[in-house]
């Protein structure tokens, strides 16, 4: 059947439609386009002659319509009048007529809308505003916006006049947003630019900020008053109810206890005409003398003295606070405070006992701190430590060595070569040494304070010839797949390169090895059972090398599941039983039995003699390394068959 | 009653120019597309330019580009083109045309002008 569709059915004006047909008979002579659902010669548009291919204009032709030879028809810049039904009459080649209709609908462009306002600044709780999308359009739909969100659900909020118009009842300060009304219709959407609600409300109960109401004096009093309030408040303050100024803030410098009263803060809204006020009441007081700490120990000496620290002056019904870098006092049994809290005594001062302290005393207002008291704790000196820590020399070369002690007062410093005394300073520098410096050299560091002194000697050799290494390790039976081991090569030499070797082999590339410390370290990360090798470190500079004599990794590991053995499972009955079980393990395991869950000998082969059925049943092997705290275990079944029904089993040794 | 008349048409020596005219009857021009087809025997019928006076836009087939110009004064209800540079090969007969704007497709009824470039 031959039809018309109309793409788009709903067209905006100045756009184009096509009448689209469907259907269209074969053999025709031609077709004819009228305006309206009949044929009428005086409303045709348009005739195509199929075989002169010509198209010929009728009387409502507009010159905007175009004719395909598929009889479809365009419509270009579409006016409102264009709207309605559009008939096709198709002439076939037998002169019989047929005929089909179509339709479509024309709607305007609309235009960007504005919003009209009855109510330019409604007052909060009094006023309503009915706001009003322009222009009125036929056929269009209107919507609103808040905050760029649909219309909340609201008895104050009412549309009307077909959504045109929205009206908020008793406005609120809430109600400031930013409004947009919406025009719709089947071609377009519009939207309007946002209008802002200027509600005028307030002024709200003032606060005055900030609360505390006590004050020291001397102090300077700065008041705040604020009131929620549009257009913002203006501010009155009355001080035992005279007024005082036309300000927000009230500062009076320097107050005295004359200063106590009632203070007032009234807030004004010139549109709303409203007035509201907040009092304070404000108290001065006389001021406290600032505290400071006395201590009767000055220099104390750590581990020897206590010291005790008193807030001064000494007031009647004070509170007295105390704080330690800042902080509360923290919880020892090194920190004593007296009944009234006015002396701290540190028992066996330390070094970190240093502080700053401070202590405070609390008024009815605020804590008056003291100023930070900080102790001079005499300790020391430590046991000195001596750098570099190389113990080999090349002759030729410079020794430079540095002594430290971690030391209050700092400590004083002596050497000594081979116990005599050589100079009294830090540093002891002597160039171009020989084998003949080779010794032992001592710093001794002494803290003139408290008279003690501490040395500490290292050897120091001096030789052409490199010594035979060593290698060190921090762990001696690490567990397998859970332990790292670091070996280090010793003595630590200047100028000197290390080498490794594991098996007589130079070490393997391997993501579990890690050279560092100049090579002279080797770490192996999550060792293995297979890391169990000898370990060879080497040193060697531009006149000699060395080699260490191998050190045996001893890894922990296992137990690995056990066997049992021999793996027969059937036997006959009068034969021996004889188990033996065997799991790998460093060290080696203990071994324990049992059959059918029953506990039986701790050894390594279980032996019954002459078995019979009665012995059927499972047979555990458990094993256990108490090294590596690791078990493991092992079931087997065995079954015993009376003399002569086995099929073909000899009997077990 | 809508009608398309064309004129202007005539013998011209190559690289001539020529100024065909298309006075519309019936609607205005404002309002559409107007267009110029041209018929050559042996060769296919081409819309050579168009102009939308409602939407501003023209357009030209590539073999006219940069020497014919249409144009249309709606206070004349007429539409112009400007030949320049003629070739032989533009010889054929001109015929006004009502064009859709997407596609190009054309209606046409006038008599035609007769355009021969020839030395």
């Known amino acids: 059947k031959l039809t018309i569709e109309s793409t788009p059915f709903n067209v905006a004006e100045g756009k184009e439609v096509l009448l689209l047909v469907h259907n269209l008979p074969q053999h025709l002579f031609g077709y004819s386009w009228y305006k309206g659902e009949r044929v009428d010669g005086n409303r045709q548009i348009i005739g195509y002659v199929i075989g002169t291919q010509q198209a010929t204009p009728g009387p409502a032709y507009s010159g905007r319509e175009i004719i395909y030879p598929n009889a479809s028809l365009l419509i270009q810049n579409i006016i409102q009048n264009d709207t309605g039904f559009y008939t096709l009459h198709v002439i076939k080649s037998d002169l019989v007529n047929e005929e089909a209709t179509g339709q479509f609908r024309v709607y305007p462009e609309l235009p960007k809308p504005s919003i009209s306002s009855n109510n330019s600044k409604p007052v909060e709780d009094k006023d309503a505003v009915a706001f009003t999308c322009e222009p009125e359009t036929q056929d269009a739909t209107y919507l609103w916006w808040v905050n760029n969100q649909s219309l909340p659900v609201s008895p104050r909020l009412q549309l009307s006049n077909g959504n045109r118009t929205l009206t908020l009842f008793n406005v609120t300060r809430n109600d400031t947003a930013s409004y947009k009304c919406e025009t719709q219709n089947p071609v377009s959407a519009r939207r309007s630019d946002s209008v802002i609600l200027n509600v005028l409300y307030g002024p709200d109960a003032p606060t005055i900020s900030p609360l505390n109401t006590s004050y020291r004096s001397g102090e300077n009093l700065n008041l705040s008053c604020h009131a929620a309030s549009n257009p913002p408040a203006q501010y009155s303050w009355f001080v035992n109810g005279t007024f005082q100024q036309s300000t927000q803030e009230l500062f009076i410098p320097n107050i005295t206890v004359n200063n106590s009263g009632s203070y007032t803060c009234q807030a004004h809204n010139s549109d709303t005409g409203l007035n509201r006020t907040t009092v304070t009441t404000i108290t001065v007081y006389a001021e406290p003398p600032k505290p400071f700490i006395t201590s009767n120990n000055s220099n104390p000496v750590e581990d020897e003295d206590a010291v005790a620290l008193t807030c001064e002056p000494e007031i009647q019904n004070t509170t007295y606070l105390w704080w330690v870098n800042n902080q509360s006092l923290p919880v020892s049994p090194r920190l004593q405070l007296s009944n009234d809290n006015r002396t701290l005594t540190l028992l066996s001062v330390t070094r970190n006992d240093v502080g700053p302290y401070e202590c405070g005393i609390q008024n009815e207002l605020s804590v008056d701190h003291s100023d930070p008291v900080i102790l001079n704790v005499l300790y020391g000196p430590d046991d000195p430590t001596i750098s570099p820590s190389y113990t080999y020399y090349r002759p030729g070369v410079n020794l430079s060595l540095s002594c430290h002690a971690a030391s209050n007062p700092p400590a004083q410093y002596s050497w000594l070569i081979d116990g005599n005394i050589q100079q009294h300073t830090q540093e002891l520098f002597i160039s171009n040494i020989t084998e003949k410096n080779s010794g032992l050299y001592t710093c001794q560091a002494n803290n003139s304070a408290s008279g003690h002194s501490r040395t500490t000697v290292k050897t120091i050799t001096v030789s052409a010839e490199l010594p035979k290494p060593s290698i060190s390790s921090n762990n001696s039976k690490p567990v397998e797949d859970k332990d790292a081991v670091a070996f280090t090569c010793e003595p630590e030499a200047q100028n000197t390169t290390y080498l490794w070797w594991v098996n007589g082999q130079s070490l393997p590339v391997s993501p579990r090895l890690q050279l560092s410390n100049g090579n002279r370290t080797l770490t192996l990360f999550n060792v293995t059972r297979n890391d169990a090798r000898a370990y060879v470190c080497g040193i060697q500079n531009s006149v000699s090398a060395n080699r260490s004599d191998p050190v045996t990794l001893d890894v922990l590991y296992g137990p690995d599941t056990p066997i049992i053995s021999p793996p027969d499972s059937s036997y006959l009955s009068g034969a021996n039983l004889n188990l033996s079980c065997h799991s790998a393990s460093n060290p080696s395991p203990q071994y324990s039995w049992r059959i059918n869950g029953i506990p039986q000998q701790h050894t390594q082969v279980l032996f019954i003699a002459k078995i019979t059925p009665n012995n059927n049943g499972t047979y555990a092997c458990f094993v256990s390394n108490l090294a590596t705290g690791r078990n493991n275990s092992i079931v087997k079944s065995i079954t015993v068959s009376a003399s002569g029904t086995s099929p073909g089993l000899s009997a077990g040794a | 009653e809508v009608q398309l008349v064309e004129s202007g048409g005539g013998l011209v020596q190559p690289g001539g120019s020529l100024r065909l005219s298309c006075a519309a009857s019936?609607?205005?021009?404002?309002?559409?597309?107007i267009g110029w087809v041209r018929r050559a025997p042996g060769k296919e019928e081409e819309l050579v330019a168009s102009?939308?006076?409602?939407?501003?836009?023209?357009r030209y087939a590539d073999s006219v580009k940069g020497r014919f110009t249409i144009s249309a004064d709606t206070s004349k209800n007429t539409a112009y083109l400007q030949m320049n540079s003629l070739r032989a090969e533009d010889t054929a007969v001109y015929y006004c045309?009502?064009?859709?704007?997407?596609?190009?497709?054309?209606?046409?009824w006038g008599q035609g002008t007769t355009v021969t470039v020839s030395s």
């Open positions: 102009i939308c006076k409602y939407t501003g836009k023209t």
């Open positions: 045309a009502i064009v859709a704007s997407g596609d190009g497709w054309y209606n046409y």
């Open positions: 019936g609607f205005n021009i404002k309002d559409t597309c």
